[in-house]
C-alpha cells in the first residue's frame, strides 16, 4: 500500500514510496521538505501560507543557517523550516492511527539539522529503521539555531526562544496534519538528544504545548541542565551587537539594528571556544533558551505541573561528560599527559561559581575521595569524566525525573542509563558511552549499515528501538508491537529505578539509585551552601575569538567516512559534536 498525494493544510504533498524488499509487500512512504512555518530574521515563526498544485516532497531542505565546524564560514539558509515524514506501510491497506514520534536534534542549540550527519546520502536521522521496525510514523524537522535561533535582549524587544517556537510550530503542524498521513494526532511522542533532549523537556513544560504532546523521551539533556537556560542573555546580545556594529545602550535600537543585519554576519559574530578557557566550555554556550515570561514563563523547576499527563523516559549515557572533559581538561584523552589535582580543582571551581570557595572545596573533596586509595591517572581521568557527566547530565536528569514523578497524574516515568561503550578506536580503554553515542542505535544504524557494526551493536539497537517505539505506542516501553529483552520497571522516588542499557539486557539490568552518594551531595549538601554575591552568570568571552575549532572526531556510525560529493551543504557534521 502507498499513500500517494496527501492533502495537508498547506496543500497537496507527494513523497516517494520505498519498497522494503524486492518481493514487494511492506514499504515506507517518505516525505522530505514539507514547509511547516516561515520566519523573518529574529522574529517568531508564522504559519506557512501554503501552495497550489502538488508539492514534490522528495529532497531534504537545507539546514538552518549556522556556522561550519571550523566556525569561519556559514552553511544552510534562512528559509529552513521544513519537516520530513516516514510512514510505514503494510501490503494491503494504508496505515491508519499510528503512533507518531517527532525527533528534535541536538547540537548545542548552535548547529544541526533534521536529517543529521550525512555520508554518501546516508543520513544519521533517517527515520526509516525506527518507523518500519516499530510501526510508527517518524517526523524530523529543522529549527533555527545559534544567534538566529536564540539571541535575546532579555526583554520584549528581542525575547529570544525563536528556535523553541520553531519546534512548537512543527509539533503543532504534526498535531493538525498527521492524521492525513495515517498518524494518530492524539498520540504524539517527542524525543530528542542533548540540546534536543533539553528542547523536548522545555516543550513539555511550555504552556504553548498544552494538549499537543502525549509522551516524551529526553536522551542526555533536560531543561534543568546548566547549559539549557541562559540567565544573562543581554550580555551576549551586546557582544554580538558590538561585533556587527549595532548600538548597545538601548535594547529597542539594538534589536532593530540586529534584525536588519546580514544573518551570516550575525551567525559568524559568535564563536564557541574549543580551546581551554577560564571557565568550562558549557559556560560559553551563549545562544540557548531563556526564561522569557511567555513561551517559558518561569524557571523550569516551577513548571512541572504542565507535565502531569505526559509520559516520560529520561536517561543519560554513562560517560556523557567525556566530550566536554576533553575540552576542559585536554589531558583526559591523552595517554602521555597527566591530569593534576590543580586541573581538576580548576574545573570544579568553574562549575561551582555560585557557591564560591566552600562549594568548590566540598565538591572537590567528595569527588577525590577515591584518589587516596587509587591515585592512578586512569582513576583521576575517570573522575574528571564522572564529574562532568554528573554536573551536566546526571544530576539535572535525576532532579527532573523526581519532579516529573512527583507532579504526575496519569503520567508514567521511566529512567535509563546507556552504557554500551563507545566504538571510537582513539578513546582510552576505560571509555564508556560518550555523549551522542546512543544516536546511532536509536536510529538503527547497525541495521542500515550492517558492515560497520557487530551483532552486539544490533542487539542494542533492536532493544532501544523496541523500548522507544513501544513507549510511543502505549506509554509503557514493555507493551507494544515489539518484544523486549527484559521488563523495564517505572521510576519511583523511593528506589530510583533505571534500566542499564548494554549489549546483554537481562532482569539484572534493572538497577536502583544511580550514583546515590553524589546525587545526595548535589541535592542536599551542595544545595544548602550559601550562594555567593555577585553575578556569576556574567562571563568574559574569550580574548581571542578568531581561533577556529579543530576537526572533532568523525561520526563512526557509517562505514565509508567520505564527505558527500553531491551536496556541499550537507558536508559531514559529526554526530559526536553536539550537546
Amino acid at each position: 500500500a502507498k499513500l500517494g498525494a496527501v492533502y495537508t493544510e498547506g496543500g497537496f504533498v507527494e513523497g516517494v514510496n520505498k519498497k522494503l524488499s524486492l518481493l514487494g509487500g511492506d514499504s515506507v512512504d517518505i516525505f522530505k521538505g514539507i514547509p511547516f512555518a516561515t520566519a523573518k530574521t529574529l522574529e517568531n515563526p508564522q504559519r506557512h501560507p501554503g501552495w497550489q498544485g502538488t508539492l514534490k516532497a522528495t529532497n531534504f531542505k537545507k539546514r538552518c543557517l549556522q556556522a561550519t565546524i571550523t566556525q569561519d564560514n556559514t552553511y544552510g539558509q534562512e528559509d529552513c523550516l521544513y519537516l520530513n515524514i516516514w510512514v510505514p506501510q503494510g501490503r494491503k491497506q494504508v496505515s491508519h492511527n499510528l503512533p507518531v514520534m517527532v525527533w528534535i536534534y541536538g547540537g548545542a542549540f548552535l548547529m544541526g539539522s533534521g536529517q543529521g550527519a550525512n555520508f554518501l546520502k546516508n543520513y544519521l536521522y533517517d527515520g526509516e529503521e525506527i518507523a518500519t521496525r516499530g510501526n510508527v510514523i517518524v517526523v524530523t524537522f529543522n529549527y533555527r539555531v545559534g544567534p538566529l535561533g536564540f539571541l535575546s535582549t532579555g526583554d520584549a524587544n528581542l525575547p529570544g526562544n525563536f528556535g523553541l517556537r520553531d519546534q512548537h510550530m512543527a509539533i503543532a503542524w504534526v498535531k493538525r496534519n498527521i492524521a492525513a498521513f495515517g498518524g494518530d494526532p492524539d498520540n504524539i511522542t517527542i524525543f530528542g538528544e542533548s540540546a534536543g533532549a533539553a528542547s523536548v523537556s522545555l516543550q513539555t513544560l511550555s504552556p504553548y504545548n498544552k494538549g499537543l504532546i502525549r509522551r516524551a523521551i529526553s536522551q542526555s539533556g533536560m531543561a534543568l541542565s546548566p547549559w539549557a537556560i541562559q540567565k544573562n542573555p543581554l550580555f551576549w546580545a551586546k557582544t554580538i551587537a558590538k561585533k556587527v556594529g549595532c548600538p548597545t545602550e538601548d535594547t529597542g535600537k539594538m534589536a532593530a539594528c540586529l534584525k536588519i543585519t546580514d544573518p551570516r554576519a550575525l551567525t559568524l559574530a559568535y564563536k564557541l571556544p574549543v580551546k581551554k578557557q577560564e571557565y568550562p566550555v558549557v559556560h560559553y554556550l551563549a545562544f540557548i533558551p531563556v526564561i522569557d515570561g511567555d513561551f517559558i514563563p518561569d524557571d523550569p523547576i516551577n513548571l512541572y505541573n504542565n507535565t502531569a499527563d505526559i509520559d516520560y523516559i529520561a536517561g543519560i549515557n554513562n560517560m556523557d561528560g567525556h566530550l566536554f572533559a576533553t575540552i576542559d581538561v585536554p589531558a583526559v584523552d591523552k595517554t602521555k599527559q597527566t591530569v593534576t589535582e590543580e586541573d581538576f580543582y580548576r574545573l570544579v571551581s568553574g562549575h561551582t561559581v555560585a557557591k564560591g570557595l566552600k562549594g568548590a572545596q566540598a565538591t572537590f573533596d567528595i569527588y577525590t575521595e577515591s584518589w587516596a586509595q587509587d591515585p592512578s591517572q586512569e582513576n583521576m581521568k575517570k573522575t574528571v569524566v564522572a564529574f562532568e557527566t554528573d554536573v551536566l547530565f546526571l544530576i539535572p536528569t535525576e532532579i527532573a525525573l523526581a519532579q516529573h514523578k512527583a507532579h504526575a497524574k496519569s503520567a508514567k516515568t521511566y529512567s535509563y542509563l546507556f552504557s554500551h561503550p563507545s566504538r571510537m578506536p582513539i578513546y582510552p580503554k576505560w571509555m564508556g558511552a560518550d555523549h551522542a553515542d546512543d544516536l546511532q542505535y536509536v536510529f538503527g544504524k547497525p541495521f542500515a549499515t550492517p558492515l560497520g557494526y557487530r551483532p552486539q551493536d544490533r542487539a542494542v539497537s533492536k532493544a532501544m528501538i523496541a523500548y522507544w517505539t513501544n513507549f510511543a505506542r502505549s506509554g509503557d516501553p514493555n507493551m507494544g508491537n515489539s518484544p523486549v529483552p527484559t521488563h523495564w520497571y517505572p521510576y519511583t522516588l523511593e528506589n530510583g529505578n533505571y534500566l542499564d542499557i548494554t549489549k546483554t539486557i537481562t532482569s539484572a539490568s534493572m538497577k536502583e539509585h544511580l550514583r546515590e552518594k553524589f546525587l545526595k551531595f548535589w541535592a542536599v549538601t551542595f544545595e544548602v551552601l550559601p550562594t555567593v554575591t555577585g553575578d556569576q552568570d556574567t562571563l568574559t568571552p574569550p580574548e581571542d575569538d578568531s581561533e577556529v575549532a579543530p576537526d572533532p572526531p568523525s561520526d563512526d556510525s557509517q562505514v565509508v567516512p567520505v564527505p558527500p560529493t553531491d551536496d556541499s551543504v550537507e558536508a559531514q557534521m559529526p554526530a559526536t559534536i553536539g550537546f
Epitope: V6, W51, A180
Partner: antibody
C-alpha cells in the same frame, strides 16, 4: 474575472449516483485546488473533498470515503464530483469552491447545484 | 477531525448595533476564515487568516483570535448584514462551524 458555473439541478432515486460538474474560467485552471462543499436544507456547510486539477490528486472527507469520486477534464477546465449509493440525507445544494491562495479560504464559489434524492 | 463550535447559533440585533460572533476549535488551528451567506446564495468570503479583510468587504467587519478562540465583529450593523455567518478552519480535513443566523430585532 473568476467564474465557476455548475450543472443544473438533479433528482435521483436512493441507491443511484449523481455527477455534478463545475466549469471554471477567468484563471489558469490547473493552478488552484477545487473543493466541493454541500449544504442540506436549513443546515450548515459540510466539506466533501478537494481535487488538484493539475495532476488529479484528491482528498476526501472520511465521511464520504468510498462513495465520492472527483475528477477533472483539463481540456474543458471542468471538475466533476460523483456521489454514489445516494440516500435521502444526501439531498443538498452542492457547491464547488476554488482556493483563494495557498492554504487559503475558499475565495470563489459556484452558484450551487440542488440534488434531490427521493423515491 | 477538528470540531468547530460557533456561538450563538442565532442572534437578534438592530441596525447600528455592535455584534460579536465567536468560534472555538476543539484543538489549536492555524487560522480561521469567516463567510457570509444569504438565503439561496453561495457563501461569500469576508475574513481570511483570522483578521485579513477580503477586498470589497466593508471595514465594519473585523476578525481576531488565535489558537482555539476566534471572533468575528461587526462594529455597526447595516441592513444588508442580516444573514448567516460561518467560521471555517482549513486543516488537512477542513470543517465549518454550524453557523450563526443574524436576524433583525
Amino acid at each position: 474575472q473568476v467564474q465557476l458555473v455548475q450543472s443544473g439541478a438533479e433528482v435521483k432515486k436512493p441507491g443511484a449516483s449523481v455527477k455534478v460538474s463545475c466549469k471554471a474560467s477567468g484563471y489558469t485552471f490547473t493552478s488552484y485546488n477545487m473543493h466541493w462543499v454541500r449544504q442540506a436544507p436549513g443546515q450548515g456547510l459540510e466539506w466533501i473533498g478537494v481535487i488538484n486539477p493539475g495532476d488529479g490528486a484528491t482528498s476526501y472527507a472520511q465521511k464520504f470515503q468510498g462513495r465520492v469520486t472527483m475528477t477533472r477534464d483539463t481540456s474543458t477546465s471542468t471538475v466533476y464530483m460523483e456521489l454514489s449509493s445516494l440516500r435521502s440525507e444526501d439531498t443538498a445544494v452542492y457547491y464547488c469552491a476554488r482556493d483563494y491562495y495557498g492554504s487559503s479560504p475558499l475565495g470563489y464559489w459556484g452558484q450551487g447545484t440542488l440534488v434531490t434524492v427521493s423515491s | 477531525d477538528i470540531q468547530m463550535t460557533q456561538s450563538p447559533s442565532s442572534l437578534s440585533a438592530s441596525v447600528g448595533d455592535r455584534v460579536t460572533i465567536t468560534c472555538r476549535a476543539s484543538s489549536s488551528i492555524s487560522y480561521m476564515h469567516w463567510y457570509q451567506q444569504k438565503p439561496g446564495k453561495a457563501p461569500k468570503l469576508l475574513i481570511y487568516a483570522a483578521s485579513s479583510l477580503q477586498s470589497g468587504v466593508p471595514s465594519r467587519f473585523s476578525g481576531s483570535g488565535s489558537g482555539t478562540d476566534f471572533t468575528l465583529t461587526i462594529s455597526s450593523l447595516q441592513p444588508e448584514d442580516f444573514a448567516t455567518y460561518y467560521c471555517h478552519q482549513r486543516s488537512s480535513s477542513p470543517t465549518f462551524g454550524q453557523g450563526t443566523k443574524l436576524e433583525i430585532k
